[in-house]
Amino acid sequence: LIQERRSHEVNPAAHLTGANSSLTGSGGPLLWETQLGLAFLRGLSYHDGALVVTKAGYYYIYSKVQLGGVGCPLGLASTITHGLYKRTPRYPEELELLVSQQSPCGRATSSSRVWWDSSFLGGVVHLEAGEKVVVRVLDERLVRLRDGTRSYFGAFMV
Amino acid sequence: LIQERRSHEVNPAAHLTGANSSLTGSGGPLLWETQLGLAFLRGLSYHDGALVVTKAGYYYIYSKVQLGGVGCPLGLASTITHGLYKRTPRYPEELELLVSQQSPCGRATSSSRVWWDSSFLGGVVHLEAGEKVVVRVLDERLVRLRDGTRSYFGAFMV
Amino acid sequence: LIQERRSHEVNPAAHLTGANSSLTGSGGPLLWETQLGLAFLRGLSYHDGALVVTKAGYYYIYSKVQLGGVGCPLGLASTITHGLYKRTPRYPEELELLVSQQSPCGRATSSSRVWWDSSFLGGVVHLEAGEKVVVRVLDERLVRLRDGTRSYFGAFMV
């Protein structure tokens, strides 16, 4: 749903959707679709997986990821961490904003059992112009993408 | 950090709650209470389970459903799908907006074990006047209603 | 219930974070950090675990709690209840607003298995000036605090 960033008129908002390219396997944040289908940017920008704030203020930020698997992959940690993190030009490390830990694999009582789980995060944070918010999932091998409706990332100014 | 909104404008919002009549067993969407208790409509209308948009714009839409059971009913799919879907007068199919899949039954290690789970969805979507949003749960037999606080559906313009 | 937002007025919002002092073991609501780190209050106040409304209107209220354990403590109910409740000067009892029930312990198949789960709640409710909203978790022994990113409580006017 494209992009609208009119100064002084619209309330900044965005909804980014999961795509085949979301999972990089590089240890970096998840990447997102910004234009096609349900995705849009309005008063926010995007760069390398990050929502970039163009107007300082308080934002409700949110993310959902769809998890799933057949049993548990060898070497998979029993904990899945899904979080929203802030990157700021004035600080070298990412800052945790909102984080969840889940043990979805424990639900599958046999190694061949199919299981699904979903993790949702949302909360209000203050963001300065130029600051970036990213989504990370550890272990991202369990994120199940499909059509942009099951894993997504968004924000709006409150 | 000031935010401006023009005086006398009401921001569309709604919160609908689960009721005994929510589960129809007909394959249709869940039905909701619109007036009693915590439920309300403000600048949105309601028809046959659907929130109906009267003013085009970007809306944060959300739903939570309370799931529960004793073991797993025979014939129950191992996956529960909870989703928000869009209906429009000029388009023949429902469009998926936000969807979650969960396998809550897998938690119960014996057939007589009581289990509970909850599914929350929320995200920003663009809606045109006249478009409708509904909630579906497959299999709805696992939705546990009580007093409108555990399963609900809402939206507000952002 | 019409709500106006005069131009140049700050929109009430808050985000409170979990801290070591959050779990009192007294049967009362969870307590929260209001100023340090990511926590803030803007147009809302705080008292003994409660967000206190200073301006009547519709608010999106939300809470997330991080649950976790090693197996299940003896005497632990199989159901964990996480809820947002309203206290009002004109009514002696707390009113349930948004509630979730989960059975996270059921995921751990052995008594020594580490497990994690997260519960998120969010929805729009009407609140009058002077009314209070609190978070309760039963059994709060399973709430896992760390740095304010995993368990939190917030609201903003819509």
Epitope: I2, Q3, R6, L36, G37, G43 | Y91 | -
Partner: antibody, heavy 118, light 107 residues
Framework: EIQLQQSGPDLVKPGASVKVSCKAS????????IYWVRQSHGKSLEWIGY????????KYNQKFKDTASLTVDKSSSTAFMHLNSLTSEDSAVYYC???????????WGQGTLVTVSA | DIVLTQSPATLSVTPGDSVSLSCRAS??????LHWYQQKSHESPRLLIK???QSISGIPSRFSGSGSGTDFTLTINSVETEDFGMYFC?????????FGAGTKLELK
């Protein structure tokens, strides 16, 4: 009024390069992506790529990734498309276009005719 | 890439006629289809977005329908100013693609 004003026609030799400009007015330039589309004579439209004027981020159609390069000059609210190693197949009208809220391409430049000929 | 096939290539009509232009996608694109009109030596003009949604300033005689892979642009009671090329465009997958166009001409 929202306008996208493109540079005039260009005649270039095979193997040469050309730079087409698109000057935006009537809105905040950094608030909307600029897309580039080409139309060969009597043919359909082909999407080349887009640029985010706010941060210079780009996305290209794989078909054009080696020949097209998109840039912006925020100070003049102008987007540029640099086309290199041109062949006669690249003779076409090149359009810049802009999205708007929930609409694809309600705003278009008037087009720039690029002719590649020896 | 998603291929959009428009038919017919040319449609000859008389003003006052009602016509339907077809656009077929090589795979499902949900409702992510848009229609443009282009007159000779002019830039394209957006007519319909997301299969059926109307655009401000576009006459109500233009309407869209369809889903999945089959889409239709209908012009109720064609007027002389409607003659020109009509293109469909998908925004479901990168790269964005356009149909080859249908030429609406005077019979």
């Amino acid at each position: 009024e929202i306008q996208l004003q493109q540079s005039g026609p260009d005649l270039v030799k095979p193997g040469a390069s050309v730079k087409v400009s698109c000057k935006a007015s009537g809105y905040s330039f950094t608030d909307y992506y600029i897309y580039w589309v080409r139309q060969s004579h009597g043919k359909s439209l082909e999407w080349i790529g887009y640029i985010d004027p706010y941060n210079g981020g780009t996305k290209y159609n794989q078909k054009f990734k080696d020949t097209a390069s998109l840039t912006v000059d925020k100070s003049s609210s102008t987007a540029f498309m640099h086309l290199n190693s041109l062949t006669s197949e690249d003779s076409a009208v090149y359009y810049c276009a802009r999205t708007s809220g929930s609409s694809w391409f309600p705003y278009w430049g008037q087009g720039t005719l690029v002719t590649v000929s020896a | 890439d998603i291929v959009l096939t428009q038919s017919p290539a040319t449609l000859s009509v008389t003003p006052g006629d009602s016509v339907s232009l077809s656009c077929r996608a090589s795979q499902s694109i949900s409702n992510n289809l848009h229609w443009y009109q282009q007159k000779s030596h002019e830039s394209p003009r957006l007519l319909i977005k997301y299969t059926y949604q109307s655009i401000s300033g576009i006459p109500s005689r233009f309407s869209g329908s369809g889903s999945g892979t089959d889409f239709t642009l209908t012009i109720n009671s064609v007027e002389t100013e409607d003659f020109g090329m009509y293109f469909c465009q998908q925004s479901n997958r990168w790269p964005l693609t356009f149909g080859a166009g249908t030429k609406l001409e005077l019979k």
